[in-house]
């Protein structure tokens, strides 16, 4: 069998095969040793018994999307049946005091590979043997502690494969310089040691994406905005836009990045090299926000200009592109190509509560039967739209441990002046957070208040 017969996936074009688009990967035209690495189709009954105590699940993730030319990293994590884990020696053991369907196990090992490898023969003293090889026959690399690595991972995409010996978790990075743009499929087959052969235990695949557009994400934050994810914001308060460029392999680390903003409110274009920007909308309505990110990234070098024409006519050699030497690249050339990323959003701007202030606090006269309680009136003003609810959160002086939260609807006139009465049980210092809210906004103010001891002899008391 060949690799492509075993790993059901895409194949490379002739161009890609010649250019070996994944550095360090091999063509799936290579032979696969099916005696050592048996191949089971989906639905084959043997999968049921490929692992003691249940099925192993492989989880494949990547840091996709990847800007073409950058590295993309794939991670595979094995999830073992309940009560099983990998120990420091790479053996699979039962967790202590863990009960599964079979109850507690007397044997601490699910798979004791250390014992197997000590028993193994046919080695030539270097740890090399006919079975310490990958599916294509290449020998295992002898890193320190390689004997504790008991899983073989075969990654396959775009007609190429990569083999890796590992523990229950592995990572593989791939350069995407010559990878086709668009969604692609990565498939991974995982084998475990089984005596002098290997047994498939899991297969997993995942879509990854290579793009020539910079992956851009924008977060938007505005003080007093009730819901930051609904793209509805408040008039007359700055919105902070923060641009995150998804570049996990730091491909653009040495690039100058320019951000070109159009806020859709006839304020023109704003160009910056800073990933954050503040903008205030002064009118209500719906606005189209557009961001273009530009970065000079490492990229392919253009072909050199054709040589100057000789003065005497010479026989034609065909198109310039037919000469393979003319298209060759100097590997160390550092050419730059402008890459662009785009973000677009429709933003709705509405009236909101812009500000809230406590302008007065008054101790309320209390009758004798409630000597431990103090009633305090907070006189509050606000700016912007009219609030429909008020909440007070009373907490300790550090404002961290909440003691009491009360919310109630309010009916406020256009002057936006209201009195909020709250009870304080006992003397001491309190932190009071007071918020005024409506459908779209939530404005907060805080104050520390000191409630003095009540004099039980005094029927009434007025505090500052």
């Amino acid at each position: 069998k060949r690799f492509h017969d075993v790993l059901g996936n895409e194949r490379p074009s002739a161009y890609m095969r010649e250019h070996n688009q994944l550095n360090g990967w091999s063509s799936d035209e290579n032979d696969w040793n099916e005696k050592l690495y048996p191949v089971w189709k989906r639905g084959d009954m043997r999968w049921k018994n490929s692992w003691k105590g249940g099925r192993v699940q492989a989880v494949l993730t990547s840091d996709s999307p990847a800007l073409v030319g950058s590295n993309i990293t794939f991670a595979v994590n094995l999830i073992f049946p309940r009560c099983q884990k990998e120990d420091a020696n790479g053996n699979i053991v039962y967790e202590k005091n863990c009960r599964n369907e079979a109850g507690l196990s007397a044997d601490p090992y699910v798979y004791n590979w250390t014992a197997w490898s000590e028993d193994s023969d046919g080695e030539n003293g270097t740890g090399q043997s006919h079975h310490n090889v990958f599916p294509d026959g290449k020998p295992f690399p002898h890193h320190p502690g390689w004997r504790r690595w008991n899983f073989i991972y075969v990654f396959h995409t775009l007609g190429q494969y990569f083999q890796k010996l590992g523990r229950c978790s592995v990572r593989v990075s791939v350069n995407t310089a010559n990878v086709t743009l668009g969604p692609q499929l990565m498939e991974v087959t995982v084998y475990r040691r089984h005596g002098r052969a290997y047994v498939p235990i899991a297969q997993v695949k995942d879509v990854y994406v290579v793009t020539d557009q910079i992956p851009v994400f924008v977060t938007m934050f505005q003080k007093n905005d009730r819901n930051s994810s609904d793209e509805t914001f408040l008039k007359d308060l700055p919105i902070m836009f923060d641009v995150l460029i998804h570049d996990p392999s730091h491909f653009l680390n040495y690039s100058t990045i320019n951000y070109k903003w159009s806020f859709g409110d006839n304020t023109g274009l704003f160009v910056s090299t800073n990933h954050t920007v503040n903008h205030t909308y002064v009118l209500n309505g719906t606005f189209s926000l557009n961001l273009t990110v530009k970065a000079a990234a490492p990229g392919p070098c253009p072909p050199p200009p054709p040589p100057p024409r000789p003065s005497k006519p010479t026989p034609s050699l065909g198109p310039a592109g037919d000469n393979p030497l003319e298209l060759s690249r100097i590997p160390d050339e550092n050419c730059q190509i402008n890459r662009y990323g785009h973000f677009q959003a429709t933003i709705t701007i509405v009236e909101g509560i812009l500000e809230v202030n406590i302008i007065q606090m008054t101790d309320v006269l209390m009758p004798v039967p409630w000597p431990e309680s103090s009633l305090i009136d907070f006189v509050v003003t606000c700016q912007g739209s009219i609030p429909t609810e008020v909440c007070t959160i009373i907490s300790d002086p550090t404002c961290e441990i909440t003691q009491n939260t009360v919310c109630s609807p309010v009916d406020v006139d256009e002057m936006c002046l209201l009195t909020v009465r709250r009870t304080f049980n006992g003397s001491g210092t309190y932190c009071v957070n007071l918020t005024l809210g409506d459908d779209t906004s939530l404005a907060l103010t805080s104050t520390l208040i000191s409630v003095p001891d009540r004099d039980p002899a005094s029927p009434l008391r007025m505090a500052n």
Epitope: G8, R11, Y15, M16, P65, G159, G182, V209, H342
Partner: antibody, heavy 115, light 107 residues
Framework: QVQLVQSGAEVKKPGASVKVSCKAS????????MNWVRQAPGQGLEWIGA????????EYNQKFKDRAIMTADKSTSTVYMELSSLRSEDTAVYYC????????WGQGTTVTVSS | DIQMTQSPSSLSASVGDRVTITCKAS??????VAWFQQKPGKAPKALIY???YRYSGVPDRFSGSGSGTDFTLTISSLQPEDFATYFC?????????FGGGTKLEIK
């Protein structure tokens, strides 16, 4: 440039079978999956399945699992989709589309099922 | 199967208008969504992959956004050649499924 050229229109009777072909050129045939999608008159798109010409690995929409067979011929860079037990509701334009999510499409083959 | 619900099913607009088409998946499809344009009697043409990335040659007035279950195709300023039917597709899991389509007509 990439081209997918499909076979000509077909008229079939209910219960019969039809085999539609899609010949690929402009790229190496075994590189990409080939999807089959159909579109009934005035309707939307419906995914039938996909085949990997490299090893004839297939994925089918369960709705067509028992009636559709996709095959690939590497020697001619052609994929085929055969649909059996035809009924009137199979009247549609059948498209092939290259890649995991199609980036290039064939021109379409009209299949009419009528008694 | 994952259902892709596209809205509106039809839309009248004028040249220069900004148009938004939405697609809602019945379950999470991450960003594994593509958008296609189809003109009468023609095969679909791929516009967008992975929810927001344009295929080469697609004008930048076309933009896609969304993740999870809610996706949007926006045409920022309609051109005469943009009047067509638009489809979304999820390729997160088999069977791949398409939205019902949005027919964009001249007002």
């Amino acid at each position: 440039q990439v081209q997918l050229v499909q076979s000509g229109a077909e008229v079939k009777k209910p219960g019969a079978s039809v085999k539609v072909s899609c010949k690929a050129s402009g790229y190496t045939f075994t590189t990409y999956w080939m999807n089959w999608v159909r579109q009934a008159p005035g309707q939307g798109l419906e995914w039938i399945g996909a085949i990997n010409p490299s090893n004839d690995y297939t994925e089918y929409n369960q709705k067509f699992k028992d009636r559709a067979i996709m095959t690939a011929d590497k020697s001619t860079s052609t994929v085929y989709m055969e649909l059996s037990s035809l009924r009137s509701e199979d009247t549609a334009v059948y498209y092939c589309g290259r890649s995991y999510s199609p980036d290039y499409w064939g021109q379409g083959t009209t299949v009419t099922v009528s008694s | 199967d994952i259902q892709m619900t596209q809205s509106p099913s039809s839309l009248s607009a004028s040249v220069g208008d900004r148009v938004t088409i939405t697609c809602k998946a019945s379950q999470n499809v991450d960003n594994h969504v593509a958008w296609f344009q189809q003109k009468p009697g023609k095969a679909p043409k791929a516009l967008i992959y992975s929810a927001s990335y344009r295929y080469s040659g697609v004008p930048d007035r076309f933009s896609g956004s969304g993740s999870g279950t809610d996706f949007t195709l926006t045409i920022s300023s309609l051109q005469p050649e943009d009047f067509a039917t638009y489809f979304c597709q999820q390729y997160k899991s088999y069977p791949f499924t398409f939205g019902g389509g949005t027919k964009l007509e001249i007002k």
